[in-house]
């Protein structure tokens, strides 16, 4: 009995066409929403005068459809037993499951004008850039609608940049009618403890912004794993939105619709500095803004983001060291609401449910030759947004489950 | 103070090749476009090739009359770019600079075309 | 392409004097894509106006430019000793880039 399910469980997860993993694979049947709150800053002109904490208050949630495409460019090779393809992004607004409208303001920091005087630190560059900011009558801060901050607004001083730049900033610019990948994985024909491990990413087998191992791209893309997953596995996974691979650990056993499922979840440990966590060390790539590799809870990005000055946190700042969020008032960090789990199916290695949860914040410091940055004492990680991206097996679906899967193994 | 050496220039035969380098410092080499431009009595100022950053994919342009006989490359770590010249004719003979145009310029390398 | 011709080729003024010198583009292009530069004897070009009206760090006051669409000029509103020198535009509008064949202007 147990040999047969586990020979049709070792058939079944098979990424190739005719499983049940593989048409599951193509087109996730989840319906995964992905929810936004907006970081609105309530004292901007205190702030770029006087280098105030910064005070804000979140707006949201705003929600979106998200990965409702199919894979694409799905290419089988028989020879090392992978399968390739690139995910296509999209984002489909949800007025009914939002707050508000696409074209609500939100008063937040200038992207450009924080961004531009960390990549052009020349002092004659910082007086050209001076002198655009001004003339495009751009400050420290600016009001945007959220249809405008997440997918982009033509930025009044990029326009005036004298040679010919892209001039589109947007949080998440571009996005829509964009793919993420190529990504090659080990479809488990072989070697079904490989299966839905990352061979490579954009063809490299490291991702090319990290020292040392901190680069490697481990595990699968979260949405399964190798099948028999136990208790003390931990479950390592890339994600090309933090520019890293990333571990969860076992948390707790979930009943999830009359299924049994394991909760991992990301803990704390993975975000800690080196001090308390020599493995990341090689994730600290800059002394000054981290106090000599202190700071936690924060993740610079910017060599994955073109240099632009973006860290990446959990939402309010949850596991972050003090001095990151001592300059921002109005965070309430909450390890339920702020944290990522993912509750895999055991048997399968499924992620039936999950709930990403991250923070784009953007580094903004003195600027003696830029005037809208001239008056600040301190530099600030602001936080812009936070995320939380969802997705839970359908009713039908967890029925079907059942049948197939957990009511034979009973 | 952002600086610019360029070297490599020299003498050489029609059809020859030669490679130019250019070494930046005092600026974040990495986040700028770079440029060679040349410039000779008879055509004045003319640029020849351009490369973009990493995060462009290092996207190159080039000047109609250069394309296929030339290939500018960088390597940001060592804060140089390159100029490879092939199949060299009597015309490319210049001064040849290293810019990322809107800094500094370097005090170029001549470059010899004739047999 | 888009040829830049610039206008006159060499000219000479008095210490004091105000001089305009030209640039015409073969094609219209934006007033932010088009730069001068400054080339005195023996050396190498120096960015001088950028974006058609900014004067870059370092240029006395007395520069000034102007222009849109396809005609650009650049002025000094009263020539010093230090000013002779070729000056050419250049546009960053499309590639390949241009230059101008440079106005030299000499100081009697």
């Known amino acids: 009995g147990d040999m047969l399910i586990e020979k049709t469980i070792k058939r079944e997860v098979v990424l190739e066409e005719g499983t049940t993993a593989f048409k599951n694979w193509v087109k996730t049947g989840t319906t995964v929403y992905r929810q936004f709150w907006i970081f609105d800053v309530q004292n901007p002109d205190d702030v770029a005068k006087n280098s105030s904490k910064i005070k804000v208050k979140q707006r949201g949630p705003y929600t979106y459809r998200v990965r409702y495409l199919a894979k694409e460019n799905i290419t089988q090779d028989p020879e090392d037993h992978t399968v390739s393809f690139v995910q296509p992004n999209g984002a489909i607004f949800e007025p009914s499951l939002s707050v508000g409208t696409e074209d609500d303001n939100f008063t937040v920091l200038n992207l450009a004008v924080a961004a531009a005087p960390h990549i052009y630190q020349n002092s004659f560059v910082q007086v050209v850039l001076n002198s655009l900011i001004k003339k495009s009558k751009s400050s420290m801060f600016q009001t945007r609608s959220l249809k405008e901050l997440l997918w982009g607004y033509k930025d009044p001083f990029l326009s005036l940049v004298p040679y010919p730049i892209s001039t589109t900033v947007g949080v998440f610019y571009p996005y829509n009618d964009t793919v993420d990948g190529v990504y090659k994985v080990f479809n488990g024909k072989d070697n079904i403890s490989k299966v839905a491990i990352i061979e490579s990413y954009k063809g490299k087998r490291n991702l090319s912004y990290w020292p040392s191992y901190c680069d490697m791209i481990n595990g699968t893309d979260a949405a399964s794993f190798p099948p028999f997953v136990e208790k003390s596995r931990t479950l390592r996974f890339f994600s090309s939105d933090i520019c890293r691979s990333i571990y969860a650990v076992f948390g707790s056993e979930i009943d999830l619709k009359g299924i049994p499922v394991y909760r991992f979840v990301l803990p704390a440990n993975a975000f800690a500095s080196p001090l308390q966590n020599p493995d990341n060390h090689c994730f600290c790539t800059e002394k000054v803004i981290s106090n000599n590799c202190t700071s936690y809870g924060v993740l610079d990005i910017g060599k994955c983001k073109e240099g632009k000055p973006v860290y990446i946190s959990l939402p309010h700042f949850l596991h972050a060291s003090p001095d990151v969020s001592e300059p921002i008032e109005g965070l309430h960090p909450n390890e339920d609401e702020h944290r990522t789990y993912l509750d895999v199916e055991p048997i399968t290695g499924f992620t039936l449910q999950f709930a990403k949860r991250l923070q784009v914040n953007i580094l903004v410091k003195p600027a003696r030759k830029i005037e809208a940055l001239k008056n600040l004492k301190r530099p600030y990680i602001v936080p812009i947004l936070w995320l939380n991206e969802t997705g839970t097996i359908g009713d039908e679906k967890a029925e079907m489950f059942k049948t197939q899967v957990t009511g034979k193994i009973k | 103070e952002e600086k610019l050496e360029e070297s490599g220039g020299g003498l050489v035969q029609p059809g020859g090749s030669m490679k130019l380098s250019c070494v930046a410092s005092g600026f974040t080499f990495s986040n700028y476009w770079m440029n060679w431009v040349r410039q000779s009595p008879e055509k004045g100022l003319e640029w020849v090739a351009e490369i973009r950053l990493k995060s462009n994919n290092y996207a190159t342009h080039y000047a109609e009359s250069v394309k296929g006989r030339f290939t500018i490359s960088r390597d940001d770590s060592k804060s140089s770019v390159y100029l490879q010249m092939n199949n060299l004719r009597a015309e490319d003979t210049g001064i040849y600079y290293c810019?990322?145009?809107?800094?500094?310029w370097g005090q170029g390398t001549t470059l010899t075309v004739s047999s | 392409e888009n040829v830049l011709t610039q206008s006159p080729a060499i000219m000479s003024a008095s210490p004091g004097e105000k001089v305009t010198m030209t640039c015409r583009a073969s094609?219209?292009?934006?007033?932010?894509?088009l730069h001068w530069y400054q080339q005195k004897s023996g050396a190498s070009p120096k960015l001088w106006i950028y974006s058609t009206s900014n004067l870059a760090s370092g240029v006395p006051a007395r520069f000034s430019g102007s222009g849109s669409g396809t005609s650009y000029s650049l002025t000094i509103s009263s020539v010093e000793a230090e000013d002779a020198a070729t000056y050419y535009c250049q546009q960053y509008s499309g590639y390949p880039l241009t230059f101008g064949s440079g106005t030299k202007l000499e100081i009697k």
């Open positions: 094609s219209s292009l934006s007033s932010t894509y």
């Open positions: 810019t990322p145009l809107l800094l500094r």
